[in-house]
């Protein structure tokens, strides 16, 4: 058999699902997985950025948090912006459950979110604009 | 609140159509803290194929190109959910999982703890 | 879970060599550096020094710089500390770990470590 069908249990040993669907359990998984937030690298970054927190209702989870740069350029060894740097974000993608409500009925849909995790230093691309 | 178990469409809706994945595909390069990306691979995961940072120099990379070790590279980690099969091997029935990736390096100035 | 497990220390005069071994199994995906440690009687672990797994790059603490080389086998997963010139003062038990920050790890930050391996210097 081809690939996908040795991959897969046999249907009757699945739960049942609706054509067009997939049953999703939101109870998550490693829910106390924490990053360390202690080590302030978002303020001692040559690139640093701080963080906003994006809240809706409807999405689960419900708070997203964004970076975003606080510099163009990079901060140099005297604490200054050297505009010769870029700060640039770095970004990730990362899936949330979306709650729609049509009329007196709910349905939910995954999306995929891209989320600014940071920022780095790099050197900057020539552009050569006039 | 949301409901525990819920059935989601099978079309995955992206909200990323704005950005053009290519734009920052060369930072790892560039970065003065650079990182190479290595294939995680998981048949029962969704999606199977997550891509991991490793900081490639412990210091950082100065304007001469070399090494600055006044200076740290660090990775910069997000946590991201993904869906898990469960039961195992079903082809339409998944948990969220929260998991840590380490997604790109950024260069800090140093917390000197243990280093002379 | 972390595994490490360090080998190769010895008892053996001033101004000789040893070569310390450290095996590691278990590293998350993002592991990037490796780093050596020691404890000497009565004193707290400290540094001694760091290899990016990568690049190779190396770091070491002053009291070491010359003296002792790191180095990595990245197919075996494991690292190495050739310590040559040995003094007296560097008699600890040795230790190696992930370092997940790199040269910006803190020691508190360390939930495991291997048994370590005893060097023992003499004059």
């Known amino acids: 058999g081809s690939e996908g069908e040795t991959f897969f249990q046999k249907p009757e040993s699945c739960p049942p699902v609706p054509g067009g669907s997939m049953k999703l359990d939101i109870g998550i998984i490693n829910e106390n997985q924490r990053v360390s937030m202690s080590r302030n690298i978002e303020s001692r970054s040559t690139s640093p950025w701080d963080y906003t927190v994006t809240w809706d209702p409807n999405r689960y989870p419900s708070e997203v948090v964004q970076a975003q740069c606080r510099n163009l350029g990079c901060i140099n060894a005297q604490g200054k912006e050297d505009i010769s740097m870029n700060s640039v974000p770095i970004q990730q993608e990362t899936l949330v459950v979306r709650r729609k409500h049509q009329g007196s009925s709910v349905s939910f849909q995954l999306e995929k979110v891209l989320v600014t995790v940071g920022c780095t230093c790099v050197t900057p691309v020539i552009h050569h604009v006039q | 609140n949301f409901p525990r178990t819920v059935m989601v469409n099978l079309n995955i809706h992206n909200r990323n159509t704005n950005t053009n994945p290519k734009r920052s595909s060369d930072y790892y390069d560039r970065s003065t803290s650079p990182w190479n990306l290595h294939r995680n691979e998981d048949p029962e995961r969704y999606p199977s194929v997550i891509w991991e940072a490793k900081c490639r120099h412990l210091g950082c990379i100065n304007a001469d190109g070399n090494v600055d070790y006044h200076m740290n590279s660090v990775p910069i980690q997000q946590e991201i959910l993904v869906l898990r099969r469960e039961p195992p091997h079903c082809p339409n029935s998944f948990r969220l999982e929260k998991i840590l990736v380490s997604v790109g390096c950024t260069c800090v100035t140093p917390i000197v703890h243990h280093v002379a | 879970q972390v595994q490490l497990v360090e080998s190769g220390g010895d008892l053996v005069q001033a101004g000789g060599s040893l070569r310390l071994s450290c095996a590691a199994s278990g590293l998350t995906g993002s592991s990037y550096a490796m780093g050596w440690f020691r404890q000497a009687p009565g004193k707290e672990r400290e540094f001694v020094a760091a290899i990016s797994w990568i690049s190779g790059d190396t770091k070491y603490t002053d009291s070491v710089k010359g003296r002792f080389t790191m180095s990595r086998d990245n197919a075996k997963k494991q690292v190495y500390l050739e310590m040559n010139s040995l003094k007296p003062e560097d008699t600890a038990v040795y230790y190696c770990?992930?370092?997940?920050?790199?040269?910006?790890?803190?020691?508190?930050?360390?939930?495991?470590w291997g048994q370590g391996t005893q060097v023992t210097v003499s004059s």
């Open positions: 770990n992930d370092m997940p920050y790199g040269l910006d790890t803190r020691m508190d930050e360390y939930v495991y």
